[in-house]
Interface confidence: medium
């Protein structure tokens, strides 16, 4: 039995629409920064790249240094939009500059977004000096927002990363000392109650110190983060992207108390050069 003419017409229209959609230009991505584009030294900033649904890779590109960071850690921001987040944990002067996004939606790359300028300032902490420029973004049809004269912009909240690490360190040492003190008291009480121990077996085993580094590392988030954007060109073979033959690389950043883990779906990963800020990366390839 022959198919109904209406059904045939519908099929043809659907196919035509599909072909047309494939040939359509990809919409330009937008870029924004959280909590803003004016960031105090040592604070964190997250660049948010947004594009349509179906994006495989987002790239954050740094102006004038020809450096970029790719991530396949793409999430759906809304039914019609996908996004990727690139985080710089501790902003330094070297991070100031212009940033933009592009994305790869098979089988092609998009145009670049507008530039977004990141400004890094000495944190002065005064009530009249806003530390962050709120909600700045550069979309397909807008320039990067300029709210630098906004007197009511929120000051950055919370402690600076370095202070936080010192505080955690001191707290851990204090707790450890307290624990030793409690154990010592208990040991003394046991000795008073039972008298001297009769054999080595009855001696209390010393408290095992947990491996803090491993413990912290195991409990950290593995969202893709950009720690200071290494100033090295990542030589990316875009055809490898198209083929989807990406290799997973785990970067464990070892930076005193700051033990964070980053998993980035790297395309043709090259040598991971230590950054100027002397943060060490241990790269472990997982096939």
């Amino acid at each position: 039995m022959s198919p109904h003419p209406t059904a045939l017409l519908g099929l043809v229209l659907c196919l035509a629409q599909t072909i047309h959609t494939q040939e359509e230009d990809l919409p330009r991505p937008s870029i924004s920064a959280e909590p803003g584009t004016v960031i105090p030294l040592g604070s964190h900033v997250t660049f948010v790249c947004r594009g349509p649904v179906g994006v495989q890779t987002f790239r954050l590109e740094r102006d004038s240094r020809s450096t970029y960071n790719d991530t396949e850690d793409v999430s759906q921001a809304s039914p019609s939009e996908s996004e990727a987040r690139f985080r710089i944990d501790s902003v330094r002067e070297g991070n100031a500059g212009l940033y933009r996004c592009i994305y790869y939606k098979p089988p092609k790359w998009s145009e670049q977004s507008d530039y977004l300028e990141l400004l890094v300032k000495e944190s002065s902490g005064g009530p009249d000096s806003p530390d962050t420029e709120p909600g700045s973004s550069a979309g397909p049809t807008q320039r990067p927002s300029d709210n630098s004269h906004n007197e009511h912009a929120p000051a950055s909240q919370g402690l600076k990363a370095e202070h936080l690490y010192i505080l955690i360190g001191v707290s851990v040492v204090f707790l450890f000392c307290l624990l030793l003190l409690v154990l010592f008291c208990l040991h003394r009480q046991n000795q008073i109650k039972q008298g001297p121990p009769r054999s080595k077996d009855e001696e209390q085993k010393p408290q095992q110190r947990p491996d803090l580094a491993v413990d912290v590392l195991e409990r950290t988030a593995d969202k893709a983060t950009v720690n200071g954007l290494p100033e090295k060109d990542r030589e990316t073979d875009t055809s490898a992207l198209a083929a989807g033959s990406s290799q997973e690389v785990t970067y464990a950043q070892l930076d005193h108390w700051a033990l964070t883990q980053r998993t980035a779906r790297a395309v043709s990963p090259q040598s991971t050069k230590p950054m100027a800020e002397s943060i060490t990366y241990a790269a472990v390839a997982r096939h």
Epitope: L98, S110, P140, T141, R143
Partner: antibody, heavy 114, light 113 residues
Framework: SSSVEESEGRLVTPGTPLTLTCTVS????????MGWVRQAPGEGLEWIGT??????TYYASWAKGRFTISKTSSTTVDLMMTSLTTEDTATYFC?????????WGPGTLVTISS | ELVMTQTPASVEAAVGGTVTIKCQAS??????LAWYQQKPGQPPKLLIY???ALASGVSSRFKGSGSGSDFTLTISDLECADAATYYC???????????????FGGGTEVEIK
């Protein structure tokens, strides 16, 4: 479908100012960077300048001061040329995009002759 | 300002053969490079963008590679229709923070025997 087209070329005498217009259709200028490229007869391609979708303009060092690119409407981009010499005789192309420059106009020949 | 150096200026190859064209930027441009094919009396046609991404409707015989300052266009299984002039172009795009411009290489004329 999207297209770009340059206005008709002309024969002008040296020193005469000339404006070329690029007319676009099928897309919005507010979402795209537009550029101008020229090619002298029998020579290679030469980038003149670009106007980004946010209105910023950038020029090749040799074009600064003599050439001006501006978006004159939602569908047109102009290339204004002054102090023209015979060296400026070329086919002028209008092109869309930054990293994906797949859309070019057919080009228009500008002849500078006395 | 950035300078793009393209080599060779011309090359002759046989049908079915392979041609390799090199393009060098005077400073690193990441992967922001395009390759075009131009035939007499026509505007340039985009072949490759972002150093290695194939433009829509372009044969997979065209392959772009490289990053930083050294780039290569390889045309394999040459056909008569491939006879044209090929250009590389920096597509980094200008901004207030750089003066790269978007210069082209000098071009490579490919002749098919």
């Amino acid at each position: 479908s999207s297209s770009v087209e340059e206005s008709e070329g002309r024969l002008v005498t040296p020193g005469t100012p000339l404006t070329l217009t690029c007319t676009v259709s099928g897309f919005s200028l507010s979402s795209y960077t537009m550029g101008w490229v020229r090619q002298a007869p029998g020579e290679g391609l030469e980038w003149i300048g670009t106007t980004s979708n946010d209105g910023s303009t950038y020029y090749a060092s040799w074009a600064k001061g003599r050439f001006t690119i501006s978006k004159t409407s939602s569908t047109t981009v102009d290339l204004m040329m002054t102090s023209l010499t015979t060296e400026d005789t070329a086919t002028y192309f209008c092109v869309r995009g930054t990293n994906i420059r797949s859309l070019w106009g057919p080009g228009t020949l500008v002849t500078i002759s006395s | 300002e950035l300078v793009m150096t393209q080599t060779p200026a011309s090359v002759e190859a046989a049908v079915g053969g392979t041609v390799t064209i090199k393009c060098q930027a005077s400073q690193s441009i990441g992967s922001n490079l395009a390759w075009y094919q131009q035939k007499p009396g026509q505007p340039p046609k985009l072949l490759i963008y972002l150093a290695s991404a194939l433009a829509s409707g372009v044969s997979s015989r065209f392959k772009g590679s490289g990053s930083g300052s050294d780039f290569t266009l390889t045309i394999s299984d040459l056909e008569c229709a491939d006879a044209a002039t090929y250009y590389c172009q920096c597509t980094y795009g200008s901004s207030n923070n750089n003066n790269y411009g978007d210069p082209f290489g000098g071009g490579t004329e490919v002749e098919i025997k």
